[in-house]
């Protein structure tokens, strides 16, 4: 699958999501990410599929990708740890942990986000926030400033309908509605936040954006608590 999938959203309040990261390849935005510890950013494994020869860095404290901002800082990556079971051709286990070259300088615009450890589905209909620098319309325009959208969680049974994702949504994945509002190309690896807690990570599977019959797919972080803890230890 490609590296990517906010459509129908709006510009985020600057620096109101201090956990938000831009995973960059050779100085350009590649994927979203989320600061989960002082020295660790969680993203999607597929994001690095094409990055073999390039320089991967993580931008923290940013609202605009291009404009100077006092809180912005680009960190080198000391270690990239994809989930051991992630594979190029599936959306399963699409998680990646990036260890920064040093601990991030924390402040109002840079702060880790608590992540869900209780392995229980988010109730369908719950409004969750997804943010990113992914494409914002059907033309494919890429924004300079962080965008966000509120999306209702969709129950797994509906998401698994033959007309939707046809059984591909395992218990380790969750879905959100995608009727005109959706995550899209370039949002992969970014956070799905419900009630101030990280619940999901945008997967980078091949998917049309903004089509209600192709809901957004998110990796449930609670299902991977043991792996995350083992890497961060």
């Amino acid at each position: 699958p490609p590296r990517g999938r906010i459509l129908g959203g709006r510009e985020a309040e600057a620096h109101a999501r201090p956990y938000m990261a831009s995973v960059q390849l050779n100085g350009a935005h590649l994927c979203g990410g989320v600061l989960v510890a002082e020295q660790w950013v969680l993203s999607a494994a597929h994001c690095l599929e094409d990055a073999a020869d390039g320089k991967v860095q993580v931008l923290l404290g940013a609202h605009s990708l291009s404009q100077p901002e006092p809180s912005k800082r680009l960190y080198d990556v000391l270690r990239a740890v994809p989930h051991p079971d992630s594979q190029p051709d599936t959306i399963d286990h699409d998680l990646l942990l990036l260890q920064l070259s040093e601990k991030a300088t924390l402040g109002p615009a840079v702060r880790p986000l608590p992540w869900q450890r209780v392995d229980r589905d988010v109730a369908p209909g719950t409004l969750c926030d997804v943010a990113g620098w992914g494409i914002v319309n059907h033309a494919g325009r890429r924004p300079d400033s962080l965008q966000h959208v509120l999306l209702p969680v969709l129950d797994r049974a509906t998401c698994n309908r033959r007309t939707h994702h046809d059984g591909a949504i395992t218990e380790r994945l969750m879905c959100a509605e995608s009727n005109r509002r959706d995550s899209c190309k370039g949002d992969s690896g970014g956070p799905l936040v419900c009630g101030g807690v990280l619940e999901g990570v945008v997967t980078s599977g091949s998917r049309v954006c903004g089509n209600r019959k192709k809901p957004g797919i998110y990796t449930r972080v609670a299902s991977y608590a043991a792996w995350i803890d083992s890497v961060l230890a």
Epitope: P2, G140, R141
Partner: antibody
Framework: EVQLQQSGAELVKPGASVKLSCTAS????????MHWVKQRPEQGLEWIGR????????EYDPKFQGKATITADTSSNTAYLQLSSLTSEDSAAYYC??????WGQGTSVTVSS | QIVLTQSPAILSASPGEKVTMTCSAS?????IYWYQQKPRSSPRLLIY???NLASGVPVRFSGSGSGTSYSLTISRMEAEDAATYYC?????????FGGGTKLEVK
């Protein structure tokens, strides 16, 4: 610097097919959508369709379904437009564009026996 | 499909004059793109998402509107603005263009 370089003018016979290319530099076509637009002489613009080069997903205006096929080769950073069963109605300039923001110089297709 | 009707089809304006052209949609759309095309040139994106100026576009250009009614305004016409202007909707597939407004210099 972002650039889209399109292939040269084509003179083709009715009933034949033609494949136009659009090679991008300064950005990775995987990162956005690539579109093709048709313009007949002294006429307006018509959106043919688009491709997401990252996954090959395409959408077309129904009027071009069966006439146009859009593909992409990410290894060469190139998008393609194939036009089949050509008639005089297909004589036009064809533009490729990245996210409708950056445009190629256009390729002129003339269908004539 | 959504039909976009641009008016007027042809418009003449003197340098320094304010110019407004409209784009009317057959049903409500969320946002509009505007393009400028000069003879023997490729189209150029002027305005995206109804009112945002594309990179390098002079500030004399502005866009506005909502629902079914959109407009492009040039605050002070310059000779180099002589061109054909097209609107395009990105709300509903297929993503249709208007027929264009040809702007001439008086």
């Amino acid at each position: 610097e972002v650039q889209l370089q399109q292939s040269g003018a084509e003179l083709v016979k009715p009933g034949a097919s033609v494949k136009l290319s659009c090679t991008a530099s300064g950005f990775n076509i995987k990162d956005t959508y690539m579109h093709w637009v048709k313009q007949r002489p002294e006429q307006g613009l018509e959106w043919i369709g688009r491709i997401d080069p990252a996954n090959g997903y395409t959408e077309y205006d129904p009027k071009f379904q069966g006439k146009a096929t859009i593909t992409a080769d990410t290894s060469s950073n190139t998008a393609y437009l194939q036009l089949s069963s050509l008639t005089s109605e297909d004589s036009a300039a064809y533009y490729c564009t990245s996210a409708m923001e950056f445009w190629g110089q256009g390729t002129s297709v003339t269908v004539s026996s | 499909q959504i039909v976009l009707t641009q008016s007027p089809a042809i418009l003449s304006a003197s340098p320094g004059e304010k110019v407004t052209m409209t784009c009317s949609a057959s049903s409500s759309v969320s946002y509009i793109y505007w393009y400028q095309q000069k003879p023997r040139s490729s189209p150029r994106l002027l305005i995206y998402d109804t009112s945002n100026l594309a990179s390098g576009v002079p500030v004399r250009f502005s866009g506005s509107g909502s629902g079914t009614s959109y407009s492009l305004t040039i605050s002070r016409m310059e000779a180099e603005d002589a061109a054909t202007y097209y609107c395009q909707q990105w709300s509903s597939y297929p993503f249709t263009f208007g027929g264009g407004t040809k702007l001439e210099v008086k």
